[in-house]
């Protein structure tokens, strides 16, 4: 069965840094990547970056910069221009679409604990679906 | 027919403040981001920012960041593109574009608005 | 940022000819190149996306090749109407960037 996982990072250079990475684990060819905040993607989230594999990148604020990492995850930095972070008790949530499998989607946030540069365990929480 | 008609050409003061328009018909606005684009005199192309019509949602190039605020009219399928603190080097001839969020590019430009910075 | 080169900033030709207009990518961009035409006075065009498809309406004298770094467009039997500066665009990565332009001379 498939999974994707999903990593929140603070930075700790910048508090209020944070970057997300997501992957996926399993067989086939994945066609889009979706990243949403504050839930998963069409069920209240909102959408901060889509990435193609092939014809690139569209982002939102307060995304800072979205990129592939292998052919099978991505991050993407994000950066507040508040003095203070919004990002710490939110959840990310990245959705991937492949090929023949269809669409799995997990969330994740920035443990409680946390120390800046330390990051959540890349395993998916509960929120996992496949369209 | 998709058409993007821009306001016209802006003469303005070193330090002051512009807002051109670029109103949308011929297509559900909703559906397509609106970008934009600068082009100095005699030189290459800037890519500005996008704006989500939808919700608002903006991505601006770092390079313009303080610089251009894009908003939206839903009202009147009108995105406006706001250049603040103007210096001769913001003179230029500013674009908007429809992005195809299926197809990953631009289908249609606006007219173009020309802004001239000159005391 | 990535940088979108274009080597040959003016190129002269005949009607009748075929020419091709080059842009290189600073990093591997995949498939994510768009061309664009932008006559005299006028807005800019789109002529190609996706490296190789051509836009709806688009002569197909018109022609995109290429991935990765390094990108063509291929212009043949030149028509006097061809007059313009051509500009490459990678949406790869943010900022998107675009090529300086090639000026294309019919003679």
């Known amino acids: 069965t498939p999974e994707v996982w999903v990593q929140v990072q603070m930075e700790a250079t910048e508090l209020s840094s944070f970057t997300v990475h997501c992957g996926f684990l399993g067989p086939g060819s994945i066609s889009l990547v979706t990243v949403s905040w504050g839930g998963p993607d069409g069920a209240g989230g909102t959408k901060l970056a889509v990435l193609h594999p092939e014809l690139g990148t569209r982002q939102w604020a307060p995304a800072r910069q979205a990129r592939w990492e292998t052919q099978s995850s991505i991050s993407l930095a994000l950066e507040d221009s508040g003095a203070s972070s919004p990002f710490a008790n939110t959840t990310f949530c990245c959705k991937f679409a492949s090929f023949p499998e269809g669409s799995w989607e997990s969330c994740g946030s920035l443990p409680p604990s946390s120390d800046p540069g330390l990051s959540a365990p890349p395993t998916p929480v509960p929120i996992l679906r496949a369209d | 027919e998709v058409q993007l008609q821009q306001s016209g050409p802006e003469l303005v003061k070193p330090g002051s403040s512009v807002k051109i328009s670029c109103e949308a018909s011929g297509y559900t606005f909703a559906d397509y981001n609106v970008d934009w684009v600068k082009q100095s005199h005699g030189k290459s192309l800037e890519w500005i920012g996008a704006i989500n019509p939808n919700d608002g949602g903006t991505s601006y190039n770092q390079k313009f960041e303080g610089k251009a605020t894009l908003t939206v009219d839903k009202s009147s399928t009108t995105v406006y593109m706001e250049l603040r603190s103007l210096t001769s080097e913001d003179s230029a001839v500013y674009y908007c574009?429809?992005?195809?969020?299926?197809?990953?590019?631009?289908?249609?430009w606006g007219t173009g608005t020309t802004v001239t910075v000159s005391s | 940022d990535i940088v979108m080169t274009q080597s040959q900033k003016f190129m002269s030709t005949s009607v009748g000819d075929r020419v091709s207009i080059t842009c290189k990518a600073s990093q591997n961009v995949r498939s994510a190149v768009d061309w664009y035409q932008q006559k005299p006075g006028q807005s800019p065009k789109t002529l190609i996306h996706s490296a190789s498809s051509r836009h709806t309406g688009v002569p197909d004298r018109f022609t995109g090749s290429g991935s990765g770094t390094d990108f063509t467009l291929t212009i043949s039997n030149i028509q006097s109407e061809d007059l313009a500066d051509y500009f490459c665009?990678?949406?790869?990565?943010?900022?998107?960037?675009f090529g300086g332009g090639t000026k294309l001379e019919v003679k």
């Open positions: 574009a429809r992005w195809v969020n299926n197809d990953w590019y631009f289908d249609v």
């Open positions: 665009l990678q949406h790869w990565n943010y900022p998107y960037t």
